[in-house]
């Protein structure tokens, strides 16, 4: 499942890139899942992807911001855990999560991605595979 791990890691890098341009994002409050319950990570992930993060269209950073946002919304390679979670109906709806401005939104997204990487690594039976 290296492809899944790479994709999650890439998303973190894209979030870090966007954090550099947080002042050029529309200061809108967006649903930002935090302390996501076990088995609802993919549901929370889709909430982050659905959020309307937008460039404020100011200055010359608009293109890189828009490309970054577009890349964040791309569907990652699916995993068994992800497929199982898609059938859960008990996870909170996106609207039920606390809304936060872009800076906190991105920080919480990064935290979730890190948690998902950690879970993915923990589910591996041995640690000597190719990184």
């Amino acid at each position: 499942q290296d492809r899944h791990m790479i994709r999650m890691r890439q998303l973190i890098d894209i979030v870090d890139q966007l954090k550099n341009y947080v002042n050029d994002l529309v200061p809108e409050f967006l649903p930002a899942p935090e302390d996501v319950e076990t088995n609802c990570e993919w549901s929370a992930f889709s909430c982050f992807q659905k959020a309307q993060l937008k460039s404020a269209n100011t200055g010359n950073n608009e293109r890189i911001i828009n490309v970054s946002i577009k890349k964040l919304k791309r569907k990652p390679p699916s995993t068994n855990a992800g497929r199982r979670q898609k059938h859960r109906l008990t996870c909170p709806s996106c609207d039920s999560y606390e809304k936060k401005p872009p800076k906190e939104f991105l920080e919480r997204f990064k935290s979730l991605l890190q948690k998902m990487i950690h879970q993915h690594l923990s589910s591996r039976t041995h640690g000597s595979e190719d990184s």
């Epitope: 290296d2 492809r3 791990m5 790479i6 890691r9 890439q10 890098d13 870090d16 490309v67 970054s68 890349k71 890190q114 990487i117 950690h118 690594l121 640690g127 190719d130 990184s131």
Partner: antibody
Framework: QVQLVQSGAEVKKPGASVKVSCKAS????????MHWVRQAPGQGLEWMGL????????IYNQKFKGRVTMTRDTSTSTVYMELSSLRSEDTAVYYC??????????WGQGTLVTVSS | DIQMTQSPSSLSASVGDRVTITCRAS??????LNWYQQKPGKAPKLLIY???RLHSGVPSRFSGSGSGTDFTLTISSLQPEDFATYYC????????FGGGTKVEIK
């Protein structure tokens, strides 16, 4: 097996630009992003940035922003790193390194760039 | 930016010695730390990723530990081929390397 082969050594004058290439083989080029790292003589490693090999999306170390440009050519499985407005402090060995799942898992052999008047 | 500080910057040891290198991050990086080995005139090679996981082909005498801000690379029994410079690298926020630790023959 995975191989990253870089272009040869370069000598440049201050103010000039240099373009280093890194040709990948042994894996699907567009499946892995690529990092660039440099090392000044007798010094440590410094991360310069990375490029998405499938879409040319780049993330640069703020220190090099405005001076570095990373590109790729999917037809030849090659990535390029161009550094402009060279100064003596840019004398270093420049490495490409594959973006593995959690680490730089394979490295090129390095390209020495000497900036001297 | 996250700063990475390695200590010592150099050390002398003999074959068979147990060697410990430490790396400290300027802020919490969880387990997002890698270790690389570099020999003179060569490119770095990945040894350990995500704090403690051995990259394929790396001998089991190498091990890594730590979490948060303090990390350790241990070589349980130094071999002739282990004399080299070792770098830690964080990947919590983009990438930063430590200054390196040169392991020399005593």
């Amino acid at each position: 097996q995975v191989q990253l082969v870089q272009s040869g050594a370069e000598v440049k004058k201050p103010g000039a630009s240099v373009k280093v290439s890194c040709k990948a083989s042994g894996y699907t080029f567009t499946d892995y992003w690529m990092h660039w790292v440099r090392q000044a003589p007798g010094q440590g490693l410094e991360w310069m940035g990375l490029i998405d090999t499938s879409e040319s999306y780049t993330i640069y170390n703020q220190k090099f922003k405005g001076r570095v440009t990373m590109t790729r050519d999917t037809s030849t499985s090659t990535v390029y790193m161009e550094l402009s407005s060279l100064r003596s402090e840019d004398t270093a060995v420049y490495y490409c390194a594959r973006y593995g799942p959690l680490a730089m898992d394979y490295w090129g052999q390095g390209t020495l760039v000497t900036v001297s008047s | 930016d996250i700063q990475m500080t390695q200590s010592p910057s150099s050390l002398s040891a003999s074959v068979g010695d147990r060697v410990t290198i430490t790396c400290r991050a300027s802020q919490d990086i969880s387990n997002y730390l890698n270790w690389y080995q570099q020999k003179p005139g060569k490119a770095p090679k990945l040894l350990i990723y995500y704090t403690s996981r051995l990259h394929s082909g790396v001998p089991s005498r190498f091990s890594g530990s730590g979490s948060g801000t303090d990390f350790t690379l241990t070589i349980s029994s130094l071999q002739p081929e282990d004399f080299a410079t070792y770098y830690c690298q964080q990947f919590h926020t983009l990438r930063t390397f430590g200054g390196g630790t040169k392991v020399e023959i005593k």
